[in-house]
Every structure is written in structure tokens, then in C-alpha cells.
Amino acid sequence: MMTGTIETTGNISAEKGGSIILQCHLSSTTAQVTQVNWEQQDQLLAICNADLGWHISPSFKDRVAPGPGLGLTLQSLTVNDTGEYFCIYHTYPDGTYTGRIFLEVLESSVAEHGARFQIP
């Protein structure tokens, strides 16, 4: 029986060109985490295997860094990075737990634009 719960960073936003940390945390279970998959909508971003360590998908290796912990750091964000991200915890003996994060990548902040065109 699955007793654990996944906590995530939920709905988050970040600026274009910046970076963001995606974090999930599995609690309330003594199940052993054997692997964590990070998926972006419909493609695999990275895998953290308890025995083999991290594997970053080749198409993302320039922009994705492992960690902190079982989380994932996305760098050089573009508006195309907007969307759903899933952390999938493979555990024994519980099975899989899934968490969802929605990332919105924004153009430079209004505050920055405002400062740039401020009337002296």
C-alpha cells in the first residue's frame, strides 16, 4: 500500500535566460527510492539512479544540472521551457509516486523595464 506523499514546488515562474531549481520531496513512507525520473511534458530530462547516479538526456546536457539532492536545475531558460514537469519516484516496495510542477518562463520583469525607462 502506498502511504507516501510527494511535495513539490508547485506552480513557479522564472525569467528568460535565468535558472530555476525543480524540487520534489517524498515523505511519509519508509520505501526505498531506487530511481527518480524527471520528465518535461513528454520527454525525459534526467534520471537519478540510486546505484548508477545521474544521467542527463543528451539533448539537455548543456542546460540541465543535477541537484540539489534529487532535484534538478534548469539553466538558460527560454519561453519554450514553459510547461509541465514531472518527478517520478520509483520506490520499493511502494511503486511509483508522481509529482507535478508547472513552470512559466517570463520575459524580463516589468520592474526592470520600468527602471530602464524611468523619467529622471
Epitope: E39, Q41, D42, Q43, T82, G83, E84, F102, E104
Partner: nanobody, 116 residues
Framework: EVQLVESGGGLVQPGGSLRLSCAAS????????MGWFRQAPGKEREWVAS????????YYADSVKGRFTISADNSKNTAYLQMNSLKPEDTAVYYC?????????WGQGTLVTVSS
């Protein structure tokens, strides 16, 4: 203009089943992901399931995994949520949305009540 129309809700006994439909228009269905969300009385809206056409990947919240199945028919621009083994805690208004959009276009939702 994006339009999403949910249907199929109703009153069902615990352990029963329902199939929700979401008819979508105003965007290219096959290039998108679609998601189902729900909002129970006095609670925040929560994600239930998502499907992506390009890969066929499906994702489920742990609370519905093994009981709910998300699917889609591209030719009809319609997404579905098959809900089995319903529990009282599944009672909520169910909404569909284009999962890729930062600002979701919500439909009116469809009410699912699970009660004996």
C-alpha cells in the same frame, strides 16, 4: 478563441464509475498536452492527470493512480477521463485545460458527486 467544454459528471455511488469528456476548440489539439484538474468544496484546484499526444505519455496524481485513465481522440478534439472505483473524496468540480499554457483557459467544469 480557446473553448473547453466539460461534460459527463453526475451523482454516483462509492465504487462506481463515470467517464468525463472535454471538447476542445481554438487550438491545435495534436500539438498540445491536455490535463484534468479538480476543485473540491473549500479546497484549491488540484492537478489530476495529463496526456501528451506526441509521445502518448500519461501522468497521474498519486490519489487517482490505478483508478483513473486519461485518453484522447484527436479526430474529435476531445479528451476523456475514465474514473473507476470512485471514492467520496473524489467529489469535486472537474475541469480540463491545455497543459502547455501558463494561463489556463478554464471551462465551466462538470460536477462529480460520490455519495451513497
Amino acid at each position: 478563441e480557446v473553448q473547453l467544454v466539460e461534460s459527463g459528471g453526475g451523482l454516483v455511488q462509492p465504487g462506481g464509475s463515470l467517464r468525463l469528456s472535454c471538447a476542445a476548440s481554438g487550438f491545435t489539439f495534436s500539438n498540445s498536452g491536455m490535463g484534468w484538474f479538480r476543485q473540491a468544496p473549500g479546497k484549491e484546484r488540484e492537478w489530476v492527470a495529463s496526456i501528451y499526444w506526441s509521445s502518448g505519455n500519461t501522468y497521474y496524481a498519486d490519489s487517482v493512480k490505478g483508478r483513473f485513465t486519461i485518453s484522447a481522440d484527436n479526430s474529435k478534439n476531445t479528451a476523456y477521463l475514465q474514473m473507476n472505483s470512485l471514492k467520496p473524496e473524489d467529489t469535486a468540480v472537474y475541469y480540463c485545460a491545455n497543459s502547455n499554457k501558463p494561463k489556463f483557459d478554464w471551462g465551466q467544469g462538470t460536477l462529480v458527486t460520490v455519495s451513497s
